[in-house]
């Protein structure tokens, strides 16, 4: 008996071939001997089966001795043995129809679980293997689960159902709702304008929800809500904003926040959360602000940084075009009685400069100039 695998919702074509290459009488029946379709001369006739409105044949092939049964919009319950009667012969074809669906929405938040459920006909014992867009393979029976979805899991999942040494392939598009980056860090000199951007890793025509930026300043004992906003069809509107700092927010995506100036009291870490309509859970992105200040007070030239810096970052003070006078893995460095000239304060990571502030030290009879 020939076995054919079909996909729920698809169309299948079951073949039936006569030895004579001409149009002769044929009938297709199901296992209950109920006629599905056949011919009367050059006319297609249909029987009283449940497939009536979904069954068809290809009249153009009859003259070649081919009498296919075409079943459209396949259902799991179409799984059956189909019998083609032609030239006093019976050809049996076993059709097994499978369906694979995501048990929830195909748009899932980062960190959520994806469950794929296989619908299969009674008596079948299929195995399923799915390959994620990042090449990860998962195997299972009737259900497959992937916990803690990551951004790289966004895309087309290819699942192969194996039964009787035959296979059928399903493709399911999964969208993981997340920000492009889990975390970002901004380095600024004191007084500079600060911009934070929160690009999303997905695109949808309509995007509605609400969000908030909570900020934990390094100098503060508790976190504070800096801004709350609404998102309606990708359009941003501010609901509430603190007076200090007075953040500005762009009206379009990507979410864009501007802090008029970087000040030591703002240095710290923020957490932007975005709750999307009809979704449980929230999207998160961490943002960090590091602020640098170079000052000269009397005979002391000081460079300080505030905010979340890693212990491997190096803070240095050097006179332009000269070797560093002081270089430490600390958040403040200073030079006593600095020579006159343009001094540079550098925050660097393995030799790569992240932040630089220049300060001009004048001969001792003058006051310092900040360029």
């Amino acid at each position: 008996k020939k076995v054919v695998l079909g996909k729920k919702g698809d169309t299948v074509e079951l073949t039936c071939t006569a030895s004579q290459k001409k149009s002769i009488q044929f009938h297709w029946k199901n296992s209950n001997q109920i006629k599905i379709l056949g011919n009367q001369g050059s006319f297609l006739t249909k029987g009283p089966s449940k497939l009536n409105d979904r069954a068809d044949s290809r009249r153009s092939l009859w003259d070649q001795g081919n009498f296919p049964l075409i079943i459209k919009n396949l259902k799991i319950e179409d799984s059956d043995t189909y019998i083609c009667e032609v030239e006093d012969q019976k050809e049996e074809v076993q059709l097994l129809v499978f369906g694979l669906t995501a048990n929830s929405d195909t748009h899932l938040l980062q960190g959520q679980s994806l469950t794929l459920t296989l619908e299969s006909p009674p008596g079948s014992s299929p195995s399923v293997q799915c390959r994620s867009p990042r090449g990860k393979n998962i195997q299972g029976g009737k259900t497959l689960s992937v916990s803690q979805l990551e951004l790289q899991d966004s895309g087309t999942w290819t699942c192969t159902v194996l039964q009787n040494q035959k296979k059928v392939e399903f493709k399911i598009d999964i969208v993981v709702l997340a920000f492009q980056k889990a975390s970002s860090i901004v380095y600024k000199k004191e007084g500079e304008q600060v911009e934070f951007s929160f690009p999303l890793a997905f695109t949808v025509e309509k995007l509605t929800g609400s969000g908030e930026l909570w900020w934990q300043a390094e100098r503060a004992s508790s976190s504070k809500s800096w801004i709350t906003f609404d998102l309606k069809n990708k359009e941003v509107s501010v609901k509430r904003v603190t007076q200090d700092p007075k953040l500005q927010m762009g009206k379009k995506l990507p979410l864009h926040l501007t802090l008029p100036q970087a000040l030591p009291q703002y240095a710290g870490s923020g957490n932007l959360t975005l709750a999307l309509e009809a979704k449980t859970g929230k999207l998160h992105q961490e943002v960090n602000l590091v602020v640098m200040r170079a000052t000269q007070l009397q005979k002391n030239l000081t460079c300080e940084v505030w905010g979340p810096t890693s212990p491997k970052l190096m803070l240095s003070l050097k006179l332009e075009n000269k070797e560093a006078k002081v270089s430490k893995r600390e958040k403040a460095v200073w030079v006593l009685n600095p020579e006159a000239g343009m001094w540079q304060c550098l925050l660097s990571d393995s030799g790569q400069v992240l932040l630089e502030s220049n300060i001009k030290v004048l001969p001792t009879w003058s006051t310092p100039v900040q360029p």
């Epitope: 901004v186 304008q193 911009e195 309509k206 359009e235 500005q248 379009k252 990507p254 501007t258």
Partner: antibody, heavy 120, light 107 residues
Framework: EVKLVESGGDLVKPGGSLKLSCAAS????????MSWVRQTPDKGLEWVAT????????YYPDNVKGRFTISRDNAKNTLYLQMSSLKSEDTAMYYC?????????????WGQGTTLTVSS | ETTVTQSPASLSVAIGEKVTIRCITS??????MNWYQQKPGEPPKFFIS???TLRPGVPSRFSSSGYGTDFVFTIENMLSEDVADYYC?????????FGSGTKLEIK
Amino acid sequence: EVKLVESGGDLVKPGGSLKLSCAASGFTFSSYGMSWVRQTPDKGLEWVATISSGGSYTYYPDNVKGRFTISRDNAKNTLYLQMSSLKSEDTAMYYCARHEDGNWNYFDYWGQGTTLTVSS
Amino acid sequence: ETTVTQSPASLSVAIGEKVTIRCITSTDIDDDMNWYQQKPGEPPKFFISEGNTLRPGVPSRFSSSGYGTDFVFTIENMLSEDVADYYCLQSDTLPLTFGSGTKLEIK
């Protein structure tokens, strides 16, 4: 009064480079996203590049990505467009335009434009 | 990318008549359509912004309507000073895209 004045347009050979400038006045330059838009008789108006108010974020259409670089100097109230690997299809009138937003949205003010001709 | 199809390409209208220009977008852009007027040798001038909002200083004979994918720009009583090119711009999503323009002339 918002004023945007473009300069730097020239005749350049294919494959060549050029930098356009736009001097802004009459508004707080550092509070607005800025863009370059070009116009040709056959292609009409075409968005070329956008930069956010502080200059940290830039956006480009695919046809100029990697060839054009938008930048700004908020201390000088000036917007720039550095163009390289120029093609004949880059020939156009280039306008500097302001967004009514710190990042991007529509264009509310335009400069008078400067002409770039790419020809051998 | 959202494509914007503008029609007609040119229009000849008698003074005092009504002018209608249409822009259709390939995706739903809510009400994020804008309209510009451009006279020869000048840069485009902002006439109508998102949400069919008339810009300050623009005469009230100009208006627009539409939502989603279909947008219409109207001049109620054509005047000789309205002779110009008119462009629509979608500002829903990047890349920002313009209509191909409509040349408005006097009949």
